[in-house]
């Protein structure tokens, strides 16, 4: 049976041109995590495997950083960086846990700073 | 212990279809992606298909030589995952096995083999 | 997508000797990779994975190594059961690479 949860950023928004950290966190199991990947719709952005450590993607090389711990830093956002990104969790022995972050890139540069991953 | 029973392999007719079936027991069904993979003496071992998890929205991804034939689904109320086979040619003939991945990117458990064989 | 290249494609050894079959990958697979071995009239499974990793209750007589293109599986003191027939795998994004297999018999 499944115990854990993941907690997310959820909802966040960022200004054009700027960065921002998406940040998961599983909590209430003590299941090894073996594997975290970082997706977004049906696009590898990062790996960090357990005993290989962190894996970014050629395609985004230049714009993603890895951490702060196992989350993912995404720099130099353009407004098509905007929709839904996936932590995935591979764990064992519980199986699978994915967690949620919609990211807007706003183009005003008044974007809103709500979350508390959020770099200034 | 854990065990995953495939069914549903036979003698089609090129053009025609097949439902594969596999049930799987001694772990949470529902917690890991599943994923098929077949051998035939010409090709060997080769990936087909593989489904995720409910909060996944069910995602699947597929070989690009099942692209379009194939459909991979799941039932985790009976612990079970189908490949729906349509427009099957001869080199879809061979043994399909049902398997959990394991680590992000291996399969640690495999079923037994259903033998599919199309030919007129 | 990348291909994975196995060699080499049969061998033949005696109990009790040492073997190693290698799997070259055509782009960079990062360790991402497994060993399964497969027995005749059996279902694969899984031996070495992320390159060198002994799955669980794999004997220590197997061990893998390599990284970026180049890895291989090493058999020492080859047991009568480690015959059979053994494949590399990569997993990359949203693919599964097997290798073309190596057939190990008995001399």
């Known amino acids: 049976m499944m115990t854990g949860t993941i907690e997310t950023t959820g909802n966040i928004s960022a200004e054009k041109g700027g960065s921002i950290i998406l940040q998961c966190h599983l909590s209430s199991t003590t299941a090894q995590v073996t594997q975290v990947n970082w997706e977004q719709q049906d696009q590898l952005l990062a790996i960090c495997n357990a005993d290989l450590g962190w894996h970014i993607s050629p395609s985004f090389k230049d714009r993603v950083a890895p951490g702060p711990g196992l989350g993912l830093t995404l720099q130099s956002l353009t407004v098509n960086d905007t929709g839904e990104y996936f932590c995935i969790y591979h764990t064992y022995p519980d199986g699978t846990y994915t967690g949620r972050i919609f990211l807007e890139v706003l183009e005003s540069s008044v974007a809103e700073h709500g979350a508390r991953f959020q770099i200034p | 212990q854990v065990q995953l029973l495939e069914s549903g392999g036979g003698l089609v007719q090129p053009g025609g279809s097949m439902k594969l079936s596999c049930v799987v027991s001694?772990?949470?069904?529902?917690?890991?992606?599943m994923n098929w993979v077949r051998q035939s003496p010409e090709k060997g071992l080769e990936w087909v298909a593989e489904?995720?998890?409910?909060?996944?929205?069910?995602?699947?991804h597929y070989a690009e030589s099942v692209k379009g034939r194939f459909a991979i689904s799941r039932d985790d109320s009976k612990s079970s995952v189908y490949l729906q086979m349509n427009n099957l040619r001869a080199e879809d003939t061979g043994v399909y096995y049902c398997t959990r991945l394991y680590y992000g990117n291996y399969f640690d458990y495999w079923g037994q083999g259903t033998t599919l064989t199309v030919s007129s | 997508d990348i291909q994975m290249t196995q060699s080499p494609a049969s061998l033949s050894a005696s109990v009790g000797e040492t073997v190693t079959i290698t799997c070259r990958a055509s782009?960079?697979?990062?360790?991402?990779l497994a060993w399964y071995q497969q027995k005749q009239g059996k279902s694969p499974q899984l031996l070495v994975y992320?390159?060198?990793t002994l799955a669980e209750g794999v004997p220590s007589r197997f061990s893998g190594s390599g990284s970026g293109t180049q890895f291989s599986l090493k058999i020492t003191s080859l047991q009568p059961e480690d015959f059979g027939s053994y494949y590399c795998?990569?997993?990359?994004?949203?693919?599964?690479?097997f290798g073309g297999g190596t057939k190990l018999e008995m001399k």
């Open positions: 795998q990569h997993h990359y994004a949203f693919s599964y690479t």
């Open positions: 782009e960079n697979t990062y360790s991402y």
């Open positions: 992320n390159a060198k």
């Open positions: 001694g772990f949470t069904f529902s917690n890991y992606w």
């Open positions: 489904i995720r998890l409910k909060s996944n929205n069910y995602a699947t």
